[in-house]
């Protein structure tokens, strides 16, 4: 009997997408490359449900984890790696006092129960996202 696996081995399925939580650490730009190399994207968050799921994964493992969000192009203007501007409704997820841009902090990470901005050249864990395979057939 052939079973359908919507996600590759060691990836996690959630609401039609597959997520890879890294076990090694890279800087933000290298995390983008790592995701591209496996046909995915450094995670872009599209809903409150997805945010809650990812925040839980990150906080459970007690890891600082890169997401695909930065203000590298224009200070204070946060943009996802797919080009979409950060919706104001998502700003509630920043930890208290963040983003604070202390010492050129231009990349966003999961930190504790929310988001933090940190220096992009720091090595952290990362999360990749890609669409799940269709199991119809």
């Amino acid at each position: 009997e052939r079973l359908c696996h919507p996600c590759p081995w060691e990836w996690t399925f959630f609401q039609g997408n597959c997520y890879f939580m890294s076990n090694s650490q890279r800087n933000w730009h290298d995390s983008i490359t790592a995701c591209q190399e496996v046909g995915a994207q450094l995670v872009v968050i599209k809903s409150a449900e997805e945010q809650n799921f990812l925040q839980l994964q990150s906080s459970r493992s007690n890891r600082f984890t890169w997401m695909g969000l930065s203000d590298l192009n224009h200070e204070g203007t946060w943009q996802w790696v797919d080009g979409s501007p950060l919706l104001p409704s998502f700003k509630q997820y920043w930890n208290k006092g963040e983003p604070n841009n202390v010492g050129e902090e231009d990349c966003a990470e999961f930190s504790g129960n929310g988001w933090n901005d940190d220096k992009c050249n720091l090595a952290k864990f990362w999360i990749c996202k890609k669409s799940a395979a269709s199991c119809s057939g």
């Epitope: 919706l87 104001p88 409704s89």
Partner: antibody, heavy 119, light 107 residues
Framework: QVQLQESGPGLVKPSETLSLTCTVS????????VHWIRQPPGKGLEWIGV???????DYNAAFMSRVTISKDDSKSQVSLKLSSVTAADTAVYYC?????????????WGQGTTVTVSS | DIQLTQSPSFLSASVGDRVTITCKAS??????VAWYQQKPGKAPKLLIY???TRHTGVPSRFSGSGSGTEYTLTISSLQPEDFATYYC?????????FGQGTKLEIK
């Protein structure tokens, strides 16, 4: 200058798929998102969805089950497909450029194309 | 979805008048409001975004203000070319939504 132009059949039969193309000039689809918005006759504006420079899409949940937006960067074209159409999908369909990196609003619009759903 | 209610729906005014159109949101949209002008048979044109930022080339007689759930578009001195329908739009969250429109007519 920045321009967007919608094209496609003006008449679609009920239950069929509406297919429209938006051809852009004066900017690159690798730098900007493009939205689709529609306006039924004599009514207001309704957002359908958007495709971003990185090819990811966001859709209005009201259309989610039957809409697909895609693009071809090399042809500077964005396409809209809306399946299982009914008379309620009769409208002027617009494509519009996202207004930059600071928000989800529309800074340049196409002139619109009228689509009638009728047998 | 966030509902936007514009008032009035119809407005009659004369050239030189100062007019104000209001847009009320069903929840706080934190200044993420844009305004568009549409003339019959034409596509809408962006006037203002982020509540008060005028788009390139928009005359200074157009201004926007507001916060929370209530936003206004003001035209300080109506010109003949300003008679049109005006729409507000929230870009706080998806789905992006519009007001029902305010038709500004010549008195």
């Amino acid at each position: 200058q920045v321009q967007l132009q919608e094209s496609g059949p003006g008449l679609v039969k009920p239950s069929e798929t509406l297919s429209l193309t938006c051809t852009v000039s004066g900017f690159s689809l690798t730098n900007y998102g493009v939205h689709w918005i529609r306006q039924p006759p004599g009514k207001g504006l309704e957002w359908i969805g958007v495709i971003w420079r990185g090819e990811s899409t966001d859709y209005n949940a009201a259309f989610m089950s039957r809409v697909t937006i895609s693009k071809d960067d090399s042809k500077s074209q964005v396409s809209l497909k809306l399946s299982s159409v009914t008379a309620a999908d009769t409208a002027v369909y617009y494509c519009a450029r996202n207004g930059g990196s600071s928000g989800w609003y529309f800074d340049v619009w196409g002139q619109g194309t009228t689509v009638t759903v009728s047998s | 979805d966030i509902q936007l209610t514009q008032s009035p729906s119809f407005l009659s005014a004369s050239v030189g008048d100062r007019v104000t159109i209001t847009c009320k949101a069903s929840q706080d949209v934190t200044s993420a409001v844009a305004w568009y002008q549409q003339k019959p048979g034409k596509a809408p044109k962006l006037l203002i975004y982020w509540t008060s930022t005028r788009h390139t080339g928009v005359p200074s007689r157009f201004s926007g203000s507001g916060s929370g759930t209530e936003y206004t578009l003001t035209i300080s001195s109506l010109q003949p070319e300003d008679f049109a329908t005006y729409y507000c739009q929230q870009h706080y969250t998806t789905p992006l939504t519009f007001g029902q429109g305010t038709k500004l007519e010549i008195k």
